[in-house]
């Protein structure tokens, strides 16, 4: 029960991570016109990954494309690829953990594969997390770089008399989002590994154990407790004695109707 | 075709009040920003407020801050200009205005005369 | 507040000539994000509201005849009227609107000579 709770949650967190950080490597937000101290503008700059936009106070926005490959700085283009690394891992992740789930069965997948293909979904999602939290930090790192950057020549004076406005840029929403994305990705996939070890726990084996009803000597070989990391070929629940108490994880699914969208 | 028609305007003592209205028609009035402009007689144009649309931001000259206060009714597509503690220098003519691309007044009204005298 | 000085303050022309008004902003209009400046130019005819000719510097109104344009970049900027015409005599106002407050220029009296 535990463990399809433990998978089912992490596939879930992981699934809502990813949704989040698509959300933010589409979002214009990744930085805003810094309005404090700021004289009031008429006019809001705001920038995403792919474009920049302008928001006027007249309701009018535009928003043009970044419509060049090497114009563009290094550091965006390390951004781009992190969040479409992220989404992919994410993706490939949430493709395998949806076939990993102990709630579905397809054919007759044994449990030693769910645990492969739990545990390979769950490293995808903590990859892609990391990925989402590493590019959204470089950005954020940028920002703030730029930001006092600008702020030490925030009034560029001409001749004493003319004034220019540098425009200074601070965290959009996008950052937020992309954070708490990928920490909710990277929960799921520790959620997904944890819940790996359950599905293919610690093997033992009681081997080579003799009773003899005659005498009195009883012989007992020792057959080693073989531990398993269940990843191994050999990760078939051997049990010898059963308590008479089963937990839902034990209990045998049979093939079922399933709608999974 | 975009029409702005304002009312309210007339004589009234210093320190009296006075609203404003403003009827917009033929056009989105809700997602439009709209404005009030002054004209003093004989003299150039002064800008008086602002009111966006969707949050309703709302921007004053200095002039009239604390004295005047914008807002909107979306339902019945009406810009307000209420009036307080008029002096001799509100004394003009006030334009209901809709501002556009590059926040630029593209649509004005006719005007309602304003005098604040005793 | 940004002061928006326009010049001259008055000017006498015959139809057919070039009008050139000048407006001088004591701040950059110009916007970094979208590279636009935010200055509109009006037309104020006697007992008239006024009307839009230019935005963003140098976008003409549609409607506007296209012997009005617009020119300039940051803090200076001109409003040219190819050939005058009769009908042009009017208020010519400049407007900043990339600062609250959206403050307007004295304007320009343009008559015939």
């Known amino acids: 029960m535990a463990v399809t709770a433990c998978q089912g949650l992490g596939f879930v967190v992981s699934l809502i991570g990813i949704a989040g950080i698509i959300a933010a490597t589409c979002m214009d937000q990744w930085s805003t016109q810094d309005l404090y101290n700021n004289p009031v503008t008429a006019v809001f700059n705001y920038q995403g990954l792919w474009r920049s936009c302008v928001r006027e106070s007249s309701g009018f926005t535009e928003c043009r494309g970044y419509f060049t490959l090497l114009g563009l700085p290094a550091m965006l283009q390390a951004v781009r690829a992190l969040m479409i690394v992220g989404i992919v891992l994410g993706a490939i992740g949430l493709l395998v953990s949806i076939f990993a789930l102990k709630c579905i069965r397809i054919g007759s997948m044994e449990d030693s594969a769910k645990a492969n293909m739990t545990l390979t979904s769950g490293i995808m999602f903590i990859v892609s997390g990391l990925c989402a939290i590493a590019g959204v930090s470089v950005f954020a790192n940028m920002l703030v770089t730029n930001f006092w950057m600008s702020t030490a020549n925030m009034y560029t004076g001409m001749g004493g008399m003319v004034q220019t406005v540098q425009t200074r840029y601070t965290f959009g929403a996008a950052l937020f989002v992309g954070w708490v994305a990928g920490g909710l990705t990277l929960i799921g996939g520790v959620m997904m590994c944890i819940a790996c070890r359950g599905l293919a726990p610690e093997e033992t084996n009681y081997k080579a154990v003799s009773y003899h009803a005659s005498g009195h000597s009883v012989a007992y070989k020792p057959g080693g407790f073989k531990a398993s990391t269940g990843f191994g070929s050999n990760t078939k629940n051997k049990k010898i004695y059963d308590g008479g108490a089963r937990t839902e994880d034990e209990v045998q699914s049979y093939p079922s109707k399933h709608d999974y969208v | 075709e975009v029409q702005l028609v304002e009312s309210g305007g007339g004589l009234v003592k210093p320190g009296g009040s006075l609203r404003l209205s403003c009827a917009a028609s033929g056009f989105t009035f809700s997602n439009s920003a709209v404005s009030w402009v002054r004209q003093a007689p004989g003299k150039g144009l002064e800008w008086v407020s602002t009111?966006?649309?969707?949050?309703?931001?709302?921007y004053y000259a200095d002039s009239v801050k604390g004295r005047f206060t914008i807002s909107r009714d979306n339902a019945k597509n009406s810009l307000y200009l209420q009036m307080n503690s008029l002096r001799a220098e509100d004394t003009a003519v006030y334009y209901c205005?809709?501002?556009?691309?590059?926040?630029?007044?593209?649509?004005w009204g006719q005007g309602t005369s304003v005098t604040v005298s005793s | 507040d940004i002061v928006m000085t326009q010049s001259p303050s008055s000017l006498s022309v015959s139809p057919g000539e070039r009008v050139t008004i000048s407006c001088k902003s004591s701040q950059s209009l110009l916007n970094s994000g979208n590279q636009k400046n935010y200055l509109a130019w009006y037309q104020q005819k006697p007992g008239q509201p006024p009307k839009l000719l230019i935005y963003?510097?140098?976008t003409r109104e549609s409607g506007v005849p296209d012997r009005f344009s617009g020119s300039g970049s940051g803090t200076d900027f001109t409003l040219t009227i190819s050939s005058l015409q009769a009908e042009d005599v009017a208020v010519y106002y400049c407007q900043n609107d990339y600062f609250y407050p959206l403050t307007f220029g004295a304007g320009t009296k343009l008559e015939l000579k």
């Open positions: 009111i966006t649309s969707g949050v309703s931001y709302t």
């Open positions: 963003w510097a140098s």
């Open positions: 205005t809709r501002q556009f691309k590059g926040n630029a007044l593209d649509y």
